[in-house]
């Protein structure tokens, strides 16, 4: 987590968070750009669906993803302030029943088409960084956030803290 | 309990420059940003900037880039705000504040520390 | 940058009045929006996050509604001890930013 402590100190606080019911505090729609203003966009081949990080054409729209905003507790043995320890976390979707979802076994970000309630594997807690780009770290797995790699989203595992302000897991969200 | 605790008052001259500090207790220091708050005298409230006290990455507004320094210390969980080349109108009371949220700041600011008065005069 | 303004500057109202404060935000900042209530010659307390829940320990005349760019803070009792300045403040984009301030007096 973003300027949080060094990140094996916070592994356990990730898997034992429970996220505080099923409906999101809010929803939005946005459009995904990296911190280089490359575009995150979506595209059908095959009966599934690609996830691709290009620059677009001029006037070319960009695809929108509906982002689920859910309250979570952040444990007290972590926190150290009880009940009051709070984290967000988002779902992102960019069409109808599908979810991006981290297969950390692969260390890829994919489309997967699913019903709710959402598997873990689907929520991302989210972090404010530099300025106003955010990132994303895996639920299940703390110190992994979503991140570019060869014009792909990618699982990046942040090595310490130190680290965390690096360019590829900073993202852009844009209602516009 | 969390708590913020403040270094003391300050008067200082034009052009120089003042640290203040803020310790923090009774929470997971390096789990929180950290915020600095300004409140000029009978004014409202002016955001400064902010630490991630685990990786030591900043951000700071605009407005006091230039002259504004935010570190940490994570053996002694003090975060410090340090402004340079004093003007009159920096003479505030200047506040740390630690966000409501792990990793966020949407949900604002849950917990202050009390203040530390810095008056800019020749 | 998002610019937050409050309204009244300032009210006088008496002991069980029904005080209204509102704020509004020059773009959509959602549900981001904080109240705070602060006493002379101390630090400002958490009053609401997320516009409409209540922090810990803060007593439950004090609501807060509004979504997108529009927002209310209501006390439905006034008591001796809500006489104070309060703030709203969006937390949708930095820099984060605070409206001007309302003053509530007794009357």
């Known amino acids: 987590a973003f300027g949080i402590s060094g990140v094996q100190k916070y592994t356990r606080a990730l898997h034992d968070s429970s996220i505080t019911g099923i409906s999101p505090i809010t929803e939005y729609l946005a459009s995904l750009s990296t911190y280089n203003d490359q575009s995150i966009t979506f595209a059908l081949e095959d009966e599934s669906y690609e996830i691709y990080v290009e620059d677009l054409k001029k006037d070319e729209k960009k695809d929108k993803v509906l982002l689920s905003y859910y309250e979570s507790q952040h444990p007290s043995n972590e926190s150290g302030d009880g009940v009051d320890g709070k984290m967000l976390m988002v779902t992102l979707s960019p069409t109808k029943d599908f979810w991006l979802h981290a297969n950390n076994k692969e260390h890829s970000v994919e489309l997967h088409k699913c019903e709710k309630p959402l598997p873990d594997q689907a929520f991302f807690v989210l972090h404010n960084m530099h300025s106003n780009c955010v990132s994303f770290e895996c639920k299940t797995d703390p110190g992994v956030f979503i991140g570019v790699k060869d014009n792909h989203l990618a699982l990046i595992k942040v090595d310490s803290s130190e680290n965390l302000c690096t360019e590829n897991i900073l993202f852009k969200l844009s209602e516009t | 309990e969390v708590q913020l605790v403040q270094s003391g008052a300050e008067v200082k001259k034009p052009g120089a420059s003042v640290k203040v500090s803020c310790k923090a207790s009774?929470?997971?220091?390096?789990?929180?940003?950290i915020n600095w708050v300004r409140q000029a005298p009978g004014q409202g409230l002016e955001w400064i900037g902010r630490?991630?006290?685990?990786?030591?990455?900043?951000s700071y507004n605009e407005l006091f880039k230039d002259r504004v320094t935010i570190t940490r210390d994570t053996s002694t969980s003090t975060a410090y705000l340090e402004l340079s080349s004093l003007r009159s109108e920096d003479t505030a009371v200047y506040y740390c504040?630690?966000?409501?949220?792990?990793?966020?700041?949407?949900?604002?600011?849950?917990?202050w520390g009390q203040g530390t008065l810095v008056t800019v005069s020749s | 940058d998002i610019q937050m303004t409050q309204s009244p500057s300032s009210l006088s109202a008496s002991v069980g009045d029904r005080v209204t404060i509102t704020c509004h935000a020059s773009?959509?900042?959602?549900?981001?929006l904080s109240w705070y209530q602060q006493k002379p010659g101390k630090a400002p307390k958490l009053l609401i996050y997320?516009?409409?829940t209540l922090h810990t320990g803060v007593p439950s005349r004090f609501s807060g509604s509004g979504s997108g760019t529009d927002f209310t803070l209501t006390i439905s009792s006034l008591q001796p001890e809500d006489f104070a300045t309060y703030y709203c403040?969006?937390?949708?984009?930095?820099?984060?930013?605070f409206g001007q301030g309302t003053k509530v007096e007794i009357k």
């Open positions: 997320k516009a409409s």
């Open positions: 773009q959509n900042i959602h549900v981001w």
């Open positions: 630490i991630a006290p685990g990786s030591g990455f900043i």
């Open positions: 009774g929470y997971t220091f390096t789990s929180y940003w």
């Open positions: 504040a630690r966000e409501f949220y792990y990793g966020s700041f949407y949900g604002g600011f849950a917990y």
């Open positions: 403040q969006q937390g949708q984009s930095s820099p984060l930013t």
